[in-house]
């Protein structure tokens, strides 16, 4: 608070203005000022046994202002309040309290809990997770064909984070086993996924080719007999899709 | 539990007076402001006269000043309301209520009605 | 005196319904104000104070916002008990003045 405060200069009588300082319109020798200039809030300040009057330009922490037509003034808060909005709704409580409704509390009531940053209670709110998303496609190491057994995950989101007294979140992700029919990899599918792919060095005039893992159930070559159309690779990889989500199983 | 009752409400003639008192008890009544508040039948809320905890200053809306005086006795914790040359437009229920900026708490009201 | 434009002066709404009534007010009143709810033959009771401070009592479906000159008053989800009328107040400084008063009534 700028407080502008007007203070007894001399020995003079009540309701003499000349040699008031500061924002005083009127003041005294023992009661310092009587009333204050416009705009300014009359406040008494409890200095040993009595009390002096000061001229604010706002009311100070503790107090609240009321502004009246003929004098604005300032009113204590109850004792364990910093700021009011009247003698009976606090709306800051002094330190080691806790708002509540206007209030200020040593403890939260049975159901609140005390917001030690804004020094409030307020409601416990306990963790919100959303529905399980989808399973993911049954894979191992990255890959969704070429082998057997896999894993399958599924994840859900945090719609509500838990207040410090609130309820901890249930896990967000689950994975189980998942058995899948043997499909050969495609072309496409091949490479490095999950661990470095294991590369021999090749032979005068040979390509350079990604070796499958010792692992791998099929060889991803392909001999002339065994392409197929375009329309029939469409259709099986259909029927393979179909096949991963009805035999897979939890272990 | 706090509780405001007001007495002395009726029915008058115009330019006559009538004497309004509000009794309250289950808060210090000698820490608050008291006030009155009028509604007229189907309007809003008026404020009609405000007199500080000690009894020292009171304050007037506009349509009753000069004719309406408020007062009140600590050692009874009574405010009244004293309405002289009461016109039509006085009609209304009357609401003692407790006054710190906000109105905090609110008796149930009396009705005066001023007819010829 | 501080103005008080209180709209709507009438609301139907239905159950369950979201609900918000404003108060303009001529000047700065910072948040020295207060809203007030009341039920047909009762007296006012106060809702709000300082601007978005619940009563103690007052259901958290009620909440109050604003500033300066701009305050709303917005009911989350109606209840039956909540039908009646409200009324805005500035507390800023003397005369206190009242806004006209909303009626909410089911639609």
């Known amino acids: 608070q700028n407080a502008s405060r007007g203070r007894r200069q001399r020995r003079m009588h009540p309701n003499v203005s000349q040699g008031c300082q500061g924002g005083c319109a009127t003041c005294s020798d023992y009661n310092g000022c009587l009333s204050c200039k416009p705009r300014l809030f009359f406040a008494l300040e409890r200095i040993g046994m009595k009390q002096i009057g000061v001229c604010l330009s706002s009311c100070p922490s503790g107090y609240y202002g009321t502004r009246y037509p003929d004098i604005n003034k300032c009113t204590k808060c109850k004792a364990d309040c910093d700021t009011c909005f009247n003698k009976n709704f606090c709306t800051k409580c002094k330190s080691g309290f806790y708002l509540h409704l206007g209030k200020c509390l040593d403890n939260c009531p049975e159901g609140l809990e005390a917001n030690n940053h804004t020094m409030e209670c307020v409601s416990i709110v306990h963790c919100e997770v959303s529905e399980w998303n989808p399973w993911s496609p049954c894979t191992k190491k990255g890959k969704t064909c070429g082998f057997k057994r896999g894993t399958e995950t599924r994840v859900r989101e945090i719609i509500q984070h838990p207040s410090a007294k609130g309820n901890l979140c249930p896990p967000t992700n689950e994975t189980r086993k998942c058995t899948v029919q043997r499909k050969k990899c495609q072309k496409g599918e091949r490479g490095k996924k999950g661990r470095e792919r294991k590369r021999k060095k090749p032979n005068k005039g040979e390509s350079k080719e990604a070796i499958p893992d010792s692992k791998s159930l099929e060889s991803s070559k392909e001999i002339p007999e065994q392409r197929e159309n375009k329309q029939q690779q469409k259709k099986r990889k259909v029927q393979d899709k179909q096949k991963s989500v009805s035999v897979s199983t939890v272990h | 539990e706090v509780q405001l009752v007001e007495s002395g409400g009726g029915v008058v003639q115009p330019g006559r007076s009538l004497r309004l008192s509000c009794a309250a008890s289950?808060?210090?009544?000698?820490?608050?402001?008291m006030a009155w508040v009028r509604q007229a039948p189907g309007k809003g809320l008026e404020w009609v006269a405000t007199?500080?905890?000690?009894?020292?200053?009171?304050y007037f809306g506009d349509s009753v000043r000069g004719r309406f005086t408020v007062s009140r006795d600590n050692s009874k914790n009574t405010l009244y309301l004293q309405m002289n040359s009461l016109r039509a437009e006085d009609t209304a229920v009357y609401y003692c209520?407790?006054?710190?900026?906000?109105?905090?708490?609110w008796g149930q009201g009396t009705m005066v009605t001023v007819s010829s | 005196d501080i103005q008080m434009t209180q709209s709507p002066s009438s609301l139907s709404a239905s159950v369950g319904d979201r609900v918000t009534i404003t108060c303009l007010v001529s000047?700065?009143?910072?948040?020295?104000f207060v809203w007030y709810q009341q039920k047909p033959g009762k007296a006012p009771k106060l809702l709000i104070y300082?601007?978005?401070r619940l009563q103690d009592g007052v259901p958290s479906r009620f909440s109050g916002s604003g500033s300066g000159t701009d305050f709303t008053l917005t009911i989350s989800s109606l209840q039956p008990e909540d039908f009646a009328t409200y009324y805005c107040?500035?507390?800023?400084?003397?005369?206190?003045?009242f806004g006209q008063g909303t009626k909410l009534e089911i639609k």
């Open positions: 209520t407790a006054h710190d900026r906000s109105f905090d708490y």
């Open positions: 289950g808060f210090t009544f000698s820490d608050y402001d």
């Open positions: 007199i500080i905890y000690d009894g020292s200053r009171a």
């Open positions: 000047e700065d009143i910072s948040n020295d």
């Open positions: 300082a601007a978005s």
């Open positions: 107040q500035q507390s800023y400084k003397y005369p206190p003045t």
